[in-house]
């Protein structure tokens, strides 16, 4: 999918209000310090290709996020305010359906936890100087 | 553990052609802009060429344009540094760096490979 | 092109605190990132972005940025922080990544 012709702002309110609370939430217990950063973004919609691929893509070790809160408040945000995402996504959780999981918070888990708090901020906070 | 490994550095002669590589690990390379950075024995850091996360974009040096070309393939998380028509003066320790980028915005070189030695000599 | 100067050496006693500057044109404009190097090593960054530090580098690292200067702050110095240190800026007015000459930090 490409995220170009979303509404940055009102995805940037959503994640304001209530993801980056359920991102913390998520993450409470952990130190801030504890994951070095090992992926970024460029610009926003490189920023939401990203976010997108770690919080609903399974990897190793973590094939959870999907079902928790922030990951569904993702979702729903993308689906309202970047025209014709719910398309592109109906197969894909179709396919999350039949793999349904034991939900299980691994340290590979927070460490992607972790990066996606930083793809988020990244998205919400382009360059203090623009030079 | 991330990681930047140089190699293909050595001893050429001026005029020649050298290729160094830069393999990635430990993080999602195909996400951030990559750099070559040289230093010459007994000099300062300097920067040589930079190319966007996506491959999309390249900019170099002015003593190097025209003559080195930085590539990149993201599905095998390497960098590359073509060098031809070597000089004497291009003799140096080059280093890969990651650095993120915001837009056309580059941030700091926050993780460097060991650096790979090349010498130019007759 | 963007020009950054910086002192060739500076000296610190051990526990005193080191200045190291980096001169540029309106540089409090432009984000400073600062990188330490010691004999045979690769560089390593100690400050970005004027004054932000990397998890991994002790708070005496710390660094500031306004009108032609920025300036690199290392206190209580110790015999492990001599190497040269560079500051360096991204110059989008022509793509460039500009770096200092280099300073060399002493530790009396």
């Known amino acids: 999918y490409d995220f170009t012709n979303c509404d940055f702002e009102k995805i940037k309110a959503a994640y304001l209000s209530t993801i980056s609370k359920d991102l913390i939430t998520y993450m409470s217990g952990t130190k801030s310090t504890e994951f070095n950063n090992t992926v970024s973004c460029s610009n926003r919609p490189h920023c939401l290709t990203e976010i997108q691929s770690l919080t609903f893509n399974p990897t190793a070790g973590c094939a959870s996020l999907a079902k928790e809160m922030f990951a569904m408040k993702t979702k729903a945000a993308l689906a309202i305010w970047c025209p014709g995402y719910s398309e592109t996504q109906i197969n894909a959780t179709q396919a999350m359906k039949k793999r349904r999981k034991r939900k299980v918070t691994t340290n590979k888990c927070l460490e992607q936890v972790s990066q996606l708090q930083g793809l988020w901020r990244r998205f919400n906070r382009p360059l203090l100087k623009q030079q | 553990q991330m990681q930047l490994v140089e190699s293909g550095g050595g001893v050429v002669q001026p005029g020649r052609s050298l290729r160094l590589s830069c393999a990635a690990s430990?993080?999602?390379?195909?996400?951030?802009?990559m750099h070559w950075v040289r230093q010459a024995p007994g000099k300062g850091l300097e920067w040589v060429a930079v190319?966007?996360?996506?491959?999309?974009?390249?900019h170099y040096a002015d003593s190097v344009k025209g003559r080195f070309t930085i590539t990149r393939d993201n599905s095998k998380n390497t960098l590359n540094l073509q060098m031809n028509s070597l000089r004497a003066e291009d003799t140096a320790v080059y280093y890969c760096a990651r650095s993120p980028q915001w837009e056309d915005i580059f941030e700091a070189f926050d993780i460097w490979g060991q650096g790979t030695m090349v010498t130019v000599s007759s | 092109s963007y020009v950054l100067t910086q002192p060739p050496s500076v000296s610190v006693a051990p526990g005193q605190t080191a200045r190291i500057t980096c001169g540029g044109n309106?540089?409090?404009?432009?984000?400073v990132h600062w990188y330490q190097q010691k004999p045979g090593q690769a560089p390593v960054l100690v400050v970005y972005d004027d004054s932000d530090r990397p998890s991994w580098i002790p708070e005496r690292f710390s660094g500031s940025n306004s009108g032609n200067t920025a300036t690199l702050t290392i206190s209580r110095g110790e015999a492990g922080d001599e190497a040269d240190y560079y500051c360096?800026?991204?110059?989008?007015?022509?793509?460039?990544?500009?770096f200092g000459g280099g300073t060399k930090l002493t530790v009396l």
């Open positions: 430990g993080f999602t390379f195909r996400t951030y802009g």
């Open positions: 190319i966007w996360y996506d491959g999309s974009y390249t």
């Open positions: 360096q800026v991204w110059d989008s007015s022509s793509s460039l990544v500009v």
């Open positions: 309106n540089i409090g404009s432009k984000s």
